[in-house]
Amino acid sequence: VPRWRQQWSGPGTTKRFPETVLARCVKYTEIHPEMRHVDCQSVWDAFKGAFISKHPCNITEEDYQPLMKLGTQTVPCNKILLWSRIKDLAHQFTQVQRDMFTLEDTLLGYLADDLTWCGEFNTSKINYQSCPDWRKDCSNNPVSVFWKTVSRRFAEAACDVVHVMLNGSRSKIFDKNSTFGSVEVHNLQPEKVQTLEAWVIHGGREDSRDLCQDPTIKELESIISKRNIQFSCKNIYRPDKFLQCVKNPEDSSCTSEI
């Protein structure tokens, strides 16, 4: 008789999840020699330990503490790039601007990027069929709690000028319910962070509006100012040209507005 299994509303654990996490850890330590002290098998064991045999709606930040400890990493605190709803461009930017880091450029962010995972209460099985959806099922699921935990730690580590890339094509350029809006904004440390600089990325070719005047950006400015952090905002009218100019800053066309 097949055992009854909880049916969740979200997609199940990414196939080859254990193999992918282990392989990513090995790749990361190859690419970042400063992280060679990390034992990838221990990292996987700690990752697994955070959610295996636990009810996937009952996960806490505490569950991830062993993994957080193993993945402790120092990134230059003044070189942090946050993003909201525009991950690909943020990653293209840090690929070129090598001294800046998104969360996914850190070991823990890299391990989990684009993956889904969950277990089942009282069994050591990984659930490849379905996992809880944040809205439809529960917010304290393994994936959401992981990102909340690492995002909070990443924001807490930031200092000086922190940059955030925002998607100007969305109805809510700044969304209070995004990870940036609900976690990172509230965990920037006013005693360390001087300024949050928002880069609003335009989508349309002919879009010359000043999206820094958008009501949601004004809302972000208000939240940040109340936290005693300065706020500045720049329009990035041509993201393609922006990236090109990061690659080749001496190009003559890079002096004009991008």
Epitope: R16, E19, T20, L22, A23, R24, V26, K27, T29, E30, I31, P33, R36, C40, H91, Q95
Partner: antibody, heavy 120, light 107 residues
Framework: QMQLVQSGAEVKKTGSSVKVSCKAS????????MNWVRQAPGQALEWMGW????????DVAQKFQDRVTITRDRSMSTAYMELSSLRSEDTAMYYC?????????????WGQGTTVTVSS | EIVLTQSPATLSLSPGERATLSCKAS??????VDWYQQKPGQAPRLLIY???NRYTGIPARFSGSGSGRDFTLTISSLEPEDFAVYYC?????????FGGGTKVEIK
């Protein structure tokens, strides 16, 4: 079994470009960083750069920064190394190579090599 | 970048003799040094990883030692198939770098 199979020998003119391919099989292509190493006749080995096939992120040795582009095609499990503005000193054997989990960060796996000859 | 200096450039020995190859790094590379053997017309073959670990299938006559800046590859008793060029490589710091090689030839 694990294999890295490279494209055939190339003869190129000075100033032109060459694109060498490395087809991986016998393992999950995205699970390992792919490195490129070259060796001029009678000379030592020289590391050129790597690509993370999962995301396409690359790093290239300073010496080759302006001339080397490393790419991949995930659907074909193939990595590519393109070298532009060829000069006679680029005449060499070009290898792709990768590490193996639990074997440090050395390269136990190598392609058979691709000979590139640059002539004026 | 880290420079690896291998010595001697050539080692002339007879089968059965002991070969000692040196690799010196221009700065500390911890234990992140690997040794390769290369024969004419062939790709390099990994012998030793992380300074002292023999790779799978490598005969026990090959051993590696050292850490920091000084590394040694020892072949306890040379077999006819061991005459080749040997390279050290460091993976501690980007870019990876190789030594200039030591040719072990038959005396």
């Amino acid at each position: 079994q694990m294999q890295l199979v490279q494209s055939g020998a190339e003869v190129k003119k000075t100033g032109s470009s060459v694109k060498v391919s490395c087809k991986a099989s016998g393992y999950t292509f995205t699970d390992s960083v792919m490195n490129w190493v070259r060796q001029a006749p009678g000379q030592a080995l020289e590391w050129m750069g790597w690509i993370d096939p999962e995301y396409g992120r690359t790093d290239v040795a300073q010496k080759f920064q302006d001339r080397v582009t490393i790419t991949r095609d995930r659907s074909m499990s193939t990595a590519y190394m393109e070298l532009s503005s060829l000069r006679s000193e680029d005449t060499a054997m070009y290898y792709c190579a990768r590490t193996k989990y639990n074997s440090g960060y050395g390269f136990p796996y190598w392609g058979q090599g691709t000979t590139v000859t640059v002539s004026s | 970048e880290i420079v690896l200096t291998q010595s001697p450039a050539t080692l002339s020995l007879s089968p059965g003799e002991r070969a000692t190859l040196s690799c010196k790094a221009s700065q500390n590379v911890d234990s992140d040094v690997d040794w390769y053997q290369q024969k004419p017309g062939q790709a390099p073959r990994l012998l030793i990883y992380k300074a002292s670990n023999r790779y799978t299938g490598i005969p026990a006559r090959f051993s590696g030692s050292g850490s920091g800046r000084d590394f040694t590859l020892t072949i306890s008793s040379l077999e006819p198939e061991d005459f080749a060029v040997y390279y050290c490589m460091q993976s501690n710091t980007h870019p990876r770098t190789f030594g200039g090689g030591t040719k072990v030839e038959i005396k």
